[in-house]
């Protein structure tokens, strides 16, 4: 709010108020009047720049008139009372409200006193943030949707998140005449490691106390990714039984396991449990290629491994032996 | 109603001063400024000054600066204008005008002739 | 001082006609602008204030427009007692300053 002059009348106003699409607004406007200044208000005026005419007048005897009756409203002045508060109540606010304002006491002996007030009309936007399920494309595409919609002016989004990425933000005419729908895309390439992690959509506007941040669990289908776990390189006659698992990871999850050789199907001391296989003890050595292949809707992938049980040595390494 | 009556015509000579009355009824006399203006015969409207009743506030048109001295009574709810070295050209017909921004209520208005 | 230049200074028209007068200020006024009808003999009578707000009691057909530097009084049918001369008043500032009258009489 503007100073005060130093003995003189002065109004007093905010330089620019906010109000919402469709809501009404106050634009507050005072004259202030310093202790030892006489005045009288004989008339309040409310003009709106680039138009001709005044909006609206308090007239000291002629009360309140207006130039649109059931948009407007003298919140204070009233007939007989003293004229020092012309703020204006303006209902419904459309778009093209937007403007500059004055707001202006005719005085005596002062002359008028005048102030202006810029009105902004806000359009509070309603923001969404969904994922965009992708495949592995080895090309950037478009992974997580930010959607601002119908905001007054045009919402602000920015992404964050550890794993690059790129915004593509576009702008289409909001529903309501003179809002704004805004669009951004978080692009990447997609890859299992990106599966499953977060990224986080930031939107601005001038109509929110704080941004607003929504975050998107990001999706990447992709076949198996297929290691076998289990064997240290380490196996001796004599030990006991050991398991190998085939560890997969894929999205969606696998649908089946299958265990075989180079050979073609399992020897009978290796007898599949889904991801798991167990490795009975053997009498004689051994020298295996074992592949377990994992299927889920994408498709199958496949990974090996050599295994060899040798004749040997201590007792205290874990390894294949009846008991 | 409201009424701004004025005291009569006045017939003066050059240098002289004339005291003109405007006795108002009809509203509270200090919740208005009262006005002065004139009007030389067959010609426009010329502002000369105003008071506030309640402060006893002025404000004079440079024109006259010097020369007029508007007063009130808030007992009788009367303004006075006068005027004083007048001259020939103050010839004029001097009309009490109540101020609401514009001039809502006029006197009758009180003929001046300055004359040797 | 402000200027208020009003024109024509003199027109004659008929029951009927509609009547337009103009009054232009030397500098911007805002709305702050009235309108009086004063007849023979008569005080002015105050038509309209803030440039187009009409007088409770002032017929319709009295009408005002503008804003900044030029404004306009219309009668849209004229009528045999709108006889009168018409002025123009700013009060923007002080000195508050009159147009020079425009002088309507009936054909």
């Known amino acids: 709010w503007p100073p005060p002059g130093t003995g003189d009348v002065v109004v007093q106003a905010p330089t620019q108020v906010p109000g919402f699409l469709g809501d009404s607004v106050t634009l507050p406007c005072y004259l202030q009047v310093p202790n030892m200044e006489v005045t009288h208000v004989s008339q309040l005026t409310w003009a709106r720049h680039g138009e001709s005419g005044s909006m609206a007048v308090f007239h000291q005897t002629q009360g309140p008139s207006y130039s649109e009756s059931k948009r407007l409203e003298f919140v204070a002045a009233r007939l007989g009372a003293e004229l020092r508060n012309a703020s204006l109540r303006m209902f419904g606010l459309r778009v093209e409200d937007e403007g500059n304002y004055t707001c202006l006491f005719v005085t005596f002996p002062q002359g008028s006193r005048s102030v202006d007030i810029w009105l902004r009309v806000l359009a509070k936007p309603q923001n969404t943030a969904e994922v965009q399920k992708v495949q592995l494309t080895g090309e950037p595409v478009p992974m997580a949707r930010c959607v601002s919609t119908g905001g007054r002016p045009p919402a602000q989004i920015t992404w964050h998140s550890d794993l690059g990425g790129m915004p593509n933000t576009s702008q289409v005419p909001g529903f309501l005449s003179g809002t704004v729908t805004v669009t951004s895309l978080w692009i990447l390439v997609p890859s299992s490691q990106v599966d499953g992690k977060n990224v986080t959509c930031k939107v601005e506007h001038e109509s929110f106390e704080k941004p607003q941040l929504l975050t998107v669990n990001l999706t990447v289908y992709y076949p198996p990714e297929v290691s076998i776990s289990g064997y240290d390189n380490n196996w001796y006659l004599g030990q006991n039984e050991a398991t190998l698992t085939c560890d997969a990871r894929s999205n969606p999850e696998p649908t089946g396991y299958n265990w075989s050789t180079t050979m073609g199907p399992l020897p009978p001391f290796a007898v599949a449990q889904g991801a798991q296989l167990l490795i009975r003890p053997v009498d004689k050595p051994i020298n295996t290629t074992l592949i377990c292949n994992v299927t889920n809707a994408l498709g199958a992938r496949q990974a090996e491994l050599t295994v060899q049980v040798k004749e040997g040595p201590p007792s205290e390494h874990s390894g294949i032996s009846r008991n | 109603e409201v009424q701004l009556v004025q005291s009569g015509s006045e017939l003066k000579k050059p240098g002289a001063s004339v005291k003109v009355s405007c006795k108002t009824s009809?509203?509270?006399?200090?919740?208005?400024?009262m006005h002065w203006v004139r009007q030389p015969h067959g010609k426009g409207l010329e502002w000369i000054g105003g008071?506030?009743?309640?402060?006893?506030?002025?404000s004079y048109n440079q024109r006259f600066k010097g020369r007029v001295t508007i007063t009130v009574d808030k007992s009788t709810s009367t303004a006075y204008m006068e005027l004083s070295s007048l001259r020939s050209e103050d010839t004029a017909v001097y009309y009490c005008a109540r101020w609401t921004g514009d001039f809502d209520y006029w006197g009758q208005g009180t003929l001046v002739t300055v004359s040797s | 001082d402000i200027q208020m230049t009003q024109s024509p200074s003199a027109m004659s028209a008929s029951v009927g006609d509609r009547v337009t007068i103009t009054c232009k200020a030397s500098q911007n006024v805002g709305t702050n602008v009235a309108w009086y009808q004063q007849k023979p003999g008569q005080p002015p009578k105050a038509l309209i204030y803030s440039a187009s707000y009409r007088y409770s009691g002032v017929p319709d057909r009295f009408s005002g427009s503008g804003s900044g530097t030029d404004f306009t009084l219309t009668i849209s049918s004229l009528q045999a007692e709108d006889l009168a001369e018409y002025f123009c008043?700013?009060?923007?500032?002080?000195?508050?300053?009159f147009g020079q009258g425009t002088k309507l009489e009936i054909k």
């Open positions: 008071i506030h009743p309640n402060s006893g506030e002025t």
């Open positions: 008043q700013q009060y923007e500032s002080y000195p508050y300053t």
């Open positions: 009809g509203y509270t006399f200090t919740e208005y400024t």
